[in-house]
């Protein structure tokens, strides 16, 4: 059961592997899912010695771990790929790493672009 969740209809889209997977590289994604299932946005990235390499962004289907999260915040210490998810339109535009071990909070701001709409 849920109450007052932010409805997710659109997310920021990005795919670093867009050429190989034959998709758009970036834009907006309209989320579609089953009835009575919640929708989320997500972001995934790598951190190579402080250099952020965005992997993917987009819609994420019903996942309890994302329920009631208004911001996209990754908390795991040092995974191969950082992952965060959230609820609310375009909530994955900005994403943050807030490590448990008390390291600095790092927020990644998107560069100003004019995104295209994916259909």
């Amino acid at each position: 059961s849920g109450r007052g969740e932010a409805e997710t209809r659109e997310c920021i889209y990005y795919n670093a592997n867009w050429e190989l997977e034959r998709t758009n590289q970036s834009g907006l994604e309209r989320c579609e899912g089953e009835q009575d299932k919640r929708l989320h946005c997500y972001a995934s990235w790598r951190n190579s010695s402080g250099t952020i390499e965005l992997v993917k962004k987009g819609c994420w289907l019903d996942d309890f771990n994302c329920y009631d999260r208004q911001e996209c915040v990754a908390t795991e210490e040092n995974p191969q790929v950082y992952f965060c998810c959230c609820e609310g339109n375009f909530c994955n535009e900005r994403f943050t790493h807030l490590p448990e071990a008390g390291g600095p909070e790092v927020t990644y701001e998107p560069p100003p672009t004019a995104p295209t709409l994916l259909t």
Epitope: S1, G2, R3, G4, E5, S44, D62, D63, F64, N65, Y67, D68, R69, V73, A74, T75, E76, P79, V81, Y82, F83, L98, E100
Partner: antibody, heavy 119, light 107 residues
């Protein structure tokens, strides 16, 4: 990083108990939390979940309407209120933390607390 | 509900052996699968998440593979501390469900 359950014991059929799970060493309010049980000599059975801010909950059919999951993020504590207990609820009850990345796995478990329902 | 099955239910092996445990989901779960180790009287311990990702602090002799409905946990060069029961768990949809377990015993 640990979870410590308490509140287990012997209770008569139809009785009530409240289990507590005290968390330390991680940002409790950032994670969905879960209860899983294991009957003596049996496998693991999923019981209940609560989202990071307590706004969403889930119950397995076997406990729906009898058990209530809740949390107090200011006290870093997870609860399971168990009413109308039955013999088949006899089990070790574990609280577990969701792994913060992708996959909906449980990376931290409590030591478990035993509930025996018997007359 | 998604049903999880495991095979074998038990396996006898010696230190140094390679042990393979399989887990099958009743419907596709993509890579939403975790593996746990449990010893008597103890809580389960996460070994593998998202089908093939090794949890921090878990020895590299453990590995996972698979996607969809069929998954495998492999223990290369079994060590004395690896004798335990192993469970798979799907995290694709509620209720999250566990396999019945595979007991790895000393031959």
């Amino acid at each position: 990083v640990q979870l410590v359950e308490s509140g287990g014991g012997l209770v008569q059929p139809g009785g009530s108990l409240r289990l507590s799970c005290s968390a330390s060493g991680f940002t409790f309010s950032s994670y969905a939390m879960h209860w899983v049980r294991q009957a003596p000599g049996k496998g693991l059975e999923y019981v209940s979940a609560i989202s990071s801010n307590g706004g969403s909950t889930y119950y397995a059919d076997s406990v729906k309407g009898r058990f209530t999951i809740s949390r107090d993020n200011s006290k870093n504590t997870l609860y399971l209120q168990m009413n109308s207990l039955r013999a088949e609820d006899t089990a070790v009850y574990y609280c577990a933390k969701t792994y913060g990345g992708y996959g909906n796995a449980f990376d931290i478990w409590g030591q478990g607390t035993m509930i025996t329902v018997s007359s | 509900d998604i049903q999880m099955t495991q095979s074998p239910s038990s396996v006898s092996a010696s230190v140094g052996d390679r042990v393979t445990i399989t887990c099958r989901a009743s419907q596709g779960i993509s890579r939403w699968l975790a593996w746990y180790q449990q010893k008597p009287g103890k809580a389960p311990k996460l070994l593998i998440y998202a089908a093939s990702n090794l949890q921090s602090g878990v020895p590299s002799r453990f590995s996972g593979s698979g996607s969809g409905t069929d998954f495998t946990l492999t223990i290369n060069s079994l060590q004395p501390e690896d004798f335990a029961t192993y469970f798979c768990q799907q995290g694709k949809s509620f209720p999250y469900t566990f396999g019945p377990g595979t007991k790895v015993e000393i031959k």
